[in-house]
């Protein structure tokens, strides 16, 4: 029962995590304009992995896609790649883990096969979570570097009368969503791996059986035959769980936060 709960919880946590990774990847607020030097701006800038946006105080929001591929910074491309790899691995992991769930009965699938699939999905979730965390962290590091560079530029060469306020960017909401989502996916993956250990066929020690030969009192005591500790078949301990398959219809969609006026 604990194994089923651990596996189920791992699946749900990973599902939420992957949904979060997808949301973070699609979000436009990876970096937002730092308002420390100009808190009364009538124009607010923010950027995502795929486009940059400008929100005017009038309510009008204009977003422009990064239509160039070669002209983009290598770091941004790397972050995109990490997030996409994370999503793909997570999606495959979810697909595998659905069939691995103990509460779902698929034909005569054995526990050992489910254990295999649970471990596979767990590893996929772990890698997916790590990809997301890495992607977000690389972007955050890029922001910090640019922030201090623009700060240095801001306070040099300001002898003239005309002030040029340089736009600096700080952490956007997507970074925090990405970190949390990556963490959840990672935790979900670990839970799946833990559940896998419980799903694996347990070691079976057959009790000694005495065979009494007629006329002879010789006892045959076969040594403790141990079942394979690998993920091979174990027909002796096969159990059928006919818990109904559950559909995951409650996955939240993430609406766009930008209204085009």
């Amino acid at each position: 029962m604990a194994v089923t709960a651990c596996q189920g919880l791992g699946f749900v946590v990973s599902l939420i995590g992957i949904a979060g990774i997808i949301a973070a990847t699609c979000m436009d607020q990876w970096s937002t304009q730092d308002l420390y030097n100009n808190p009364v701006t009538a124009v607010f800038n923010y950027q995502g992995l795929w486009r940059s946006c400008v929100r005017e105080s009038s309510g009008f929001t204009e977003c422009r896609g990064y239509f160039t591929l070669l002209g983009l910074p290598a770091m941004l491309q790397a972050v995109r790649a990490l997030m996409i790899v994370g999503i793909v691995l997570g999606a495959i992991g979810l697909l595998v883990s659905i069939f691995a769930l103990k509460c779902i009965r698929i034909g005569s699938m054995e526990d050992s096969a489910k254990a295999n699939m649970t471990l596979t999905s767990g590893i996929m979730f772990i890698v997916s979570g790590l990809c997301a965390i890495a992607g977000v962290s690389v972007f955050a590091n890029m922001l910090v570097t640019n922030f201090w560079m623009s700060t240095a530029n801001m306070y040099t060469g300001m002898g003239g009368m005309v002030q040029t306020v340089q736009t600096r960017y700080t952490f956007g909401a997507a970074l925090f969503v990405g970190w949390v989502a990556g963490g959840l996916t990672l935790i979900g993956g670990v839970m799946m791996c833990i559940a896998c250990r419980g799903l694996a066929p347990e070691e079976t020690n057959y009790k000694a059986v005495s065979y009494h030969a007629s006329g002879h009192s010789v006892a045959y005591k076969p040594g403790g035959f141990k079942a394979s500790t690998g993920f091979g078949s174990n027909t002796k301990n096969k159990k059928i769980y006919d818990g109904g398959a559950r559909t995951e219809d409650e996955v939240q969609s993430y609406p766009s936060k930008h209204d085009y006026v």
């Epitope: 100009n38 009364v40 701006t41 009538a42 124009v43 946006c53 309510g59 009008f60 002030q163 040029t164």
Partner: antibody, heavy 119, light 113 residues
Framework: EVQLVESGGGLVQPGGSLRLSCAAS????????MHWVRQAPGKGLEWVAY????????YYADTVKGRFTISRDNPKNSLYLQMNSLRAEDTAVYYC????????????WGQGTTVTVSS | DVVLTQSPDSLAVSLGERATISCKSS????????????LTWYQQKPGQTPTLLIY???TRKSGVPDRFSGSGSGTDFTLTISSLQAEDVAVYYC?????????FGGGTKVEIK
């Protein structure tokens, strides 16, 4: 057709108070930021205050800060300007305007209401 | 606060001639995010309310005659009336719409010579 109609202007003594209203129609009032702009007799335009669509952001000109309060009632499609501690230099025609257009531009203006501060 | 300095204060131009109004800002009004300048031009005819002419420093509002054009970037902006018409007699104002307070220039009165 977008319409902005100001009211509430009049003659008031220095130190007195007045509340200006602006009734909006012809557009989704609750979706747009609103401004008050004034023009003293024979002088140029002076921006007074701004309030965002949901009242989350409010800004004032330094000359009126602490004395004037901008507010809005979206269900009533109304904009207000509460003016306290009025001075002679506050004498002007007060316009309400909306940033209905791109670029934060003040696209639509009311006809204005006259405020005279005199003893 | 952003200070906008308009020049000249008044301008007398013959009908059909070019009128040029300058507006200088104490701070850059250029927004890197969308590569646009947040300066707006208004026209106020005698006894009337102001009307929007140009936004984003150079984009004409629909319905505005093409003899009106805006140019400039950063801190220096210009409004040009290529061929002055009688109905163009008015006071022209530039406005900073980049940061609060949304300051106006002092205005330039355009008259017919």
């Amino acid at each position: 057709e977008v319409q902005l109609v100001e009211s509430g202007g009049g003659l008031v003594q220095p130190g007195g108070s007045l509340r200006l209203s602006c009734a909006a129609s012809g557009f989704t009032f609750s979706s747009f930021g609103m401004h008050w702009v004034r023009q003293a007799p024979g002088k140029g335009l002076e921006w007074v205050a701004y309030i965002s669509s949901g009242s989350g952001s409010i800004y004032y000109a330094d000359t009126v800060k602490g004395r004037f309060t901008i507010s809005r009632d979206n269900p009533k499609n109304s904009l207000y300007l509460q003016m306290n501690s009025l001075r002679a230099e506050d004498t002007a025609v007060y316009y309400c305007a909306t940033s209905y257009y791109y670029g934060n531009a003040l696209e639509y203006w009311g006809q204005g209401t006259t405020v005279t501060v005199s003893s | 606060d952003v200070v906008l300095t308009q020049s000249p204060d008044s301008l007398a131009v013959s009908l059909g001639e070019r009128a040029t109004i300058s507006c200088k800002s104490s701070q850059s009004l250029f927004n890197v995010g969308n590569q646009k300048n947040y300066l707006t031009w208004y026209q106020q005819k005698p006894g009337q309310t102001p009307t929007l002419l140009i936004y984003w420093a150079s984009t004409r509002k629909s319905g505005v005659p093409d003899r009106f054009s805006g140019s400039g970037s950063g801190t220096d902006f210009t409004l040009t009336i290529s061929s002055l018409q009688a109905e163009d007699v008015a006071v022209y104002y530039c406005q900073n719409v980049y940061s609060y307070p949304l300051t106006f220039g002092g205005g330039t009165k355009v008259e017919i010579k």
